[in-house]
Amino acid sequence: CKAMHVAQPAVVLASSRGIASFVCEYASPGKATEVRVTVLRQADSQVTEVCAATYMMGNELTFLDDSICTGTSSGNQVNLTIQGLRAMDTGLYICKVELMYPPPYYLGIGNGTQIYVIDPEPCPDSDF
């Protein structure tokens, strides 16, 4: 069966500092040496690319310098962290995994992680 399944948590709550972390795990049907991981955000039927990184198996996952994502990889598991999130960024974050090399190419798309972001209440001014 030519299948690559991707698993990710259903729901994650971002921290008060606007940081959300989740694991994206894939069952690889082949021995890939080059893997691309993309985080897609789906909200109101609009899909946008949040970030993407290509890594060589055994090496670290590196996103672009201006990316809001960071991550680490271990085997067929990627630990993703998205920062700078605000309430308006609440939505479904989908993990897409592509086995880029060697051939054949395989695609795997997770069901998505619903990330809830709650903006912190501003601290009331204190009079001393």
Epitope: M4, A52, K96
Partner: antibody, heavy 119, light 108 residues
């Protein structure tokens, strides 16, 4: 809006070469896989080649391996197909098509350019 | 390589009738990564369905897709005059990406 415009088709003799171009606009070109799909006269669709993102990874259908080369210029939003050692069976309309965020299916296609290989 | 077989080769129907088109894969592939296209003479194909069952933007709800594993179906609930065309399925779970040979839906 997304636009894909192919050019470079024409009549060429067997064994000769031709280079097709596809000018893309209306989207972030480097974020998508780009493909060539062909259709011989009166026949079905045949996927030919794909090139991903930064251009390092390329795959081809077996029948064109070693003869065709797909490439892209992300700074100019242009996709290319260099076709060498052309054969009569390469005669077809060649479409450039964009992959999607959710996989390599094709939501946008060019109008197609006809390549005729004949002596 | 995953080979896709479509049946029937030609379907002769009248406007208002329903159409059921089949696409069968030579082996099971990733998570229903199957698309359907419509093509009219002299035009580029138009995406109808992806992910086996998700309608593409702007596609009328008389078009629906279903199936999983190796067997997939495109259903057109009530044929409109503009629906008479050739329909192709395509798998995109693994390379090489492959199309079925097509089903022609023509007017009876």
């Amino acid at each position: 809006q997304v636009q894909l415009v192919e050019s470079g088709g024409g009549v060429v003799q067997p064994g000769r070469s031709l280079r097709l171009s596809c000018a893309a606009s209306g989207f972030t070109f480097s974020s998508f896989g780009m493909h060539w799909v062909r259709q011989a006269p009166g026949k079905g669709l045949e996927w030919v080649a794909v090139i991903w993102y930064d251009g390092r990874n390329k795959y081809y259908v077996d029948s064109v391996k070693g003869r065709f080369t797909i490439s892209r210029d992300n700074s100019n939003n242009t996709l290319y197909l260099q076709m060498n050692s052309l054969r009569a069976e390469d005669t077809a309309v060649y479409y450039c098509a964009r992959g999607e965020f959710f996989g390599e299916f094709f939501d946008y296609w060019g109008q197609g350019t006809l390549v005729t290989v004949s002596s | 390589e995953i080979v896709l077989t479509q049946s029937p080769g030609t379907l002769s129907l009248s406007p208002g009738e329903g159409a059921t088109l089949s696409c069968r894969a030579s082996q099971s592939f990733s998570s229903n990564y199957l698309a359907w296209y419509q093509q009219k003479p002299g035009q580029a194909p138009r995406l109808l369905i992806y992910g086996a069952s998700s309608r593409a933007t702007g596609i009328p709800d008389r078009f629906s897709g279903s199936g999983s594993g190796t067997d997939f179906t495109l259903t057109i609930s009530r044929l409109e005059p503009e629906d008479f065309a050739v329909y192709y399925c395509q798998q995109y779970g693994t390379s090489p990406f492959t199309f079925g040979p097509g089903t022609k839906v023509d007017i009876k």
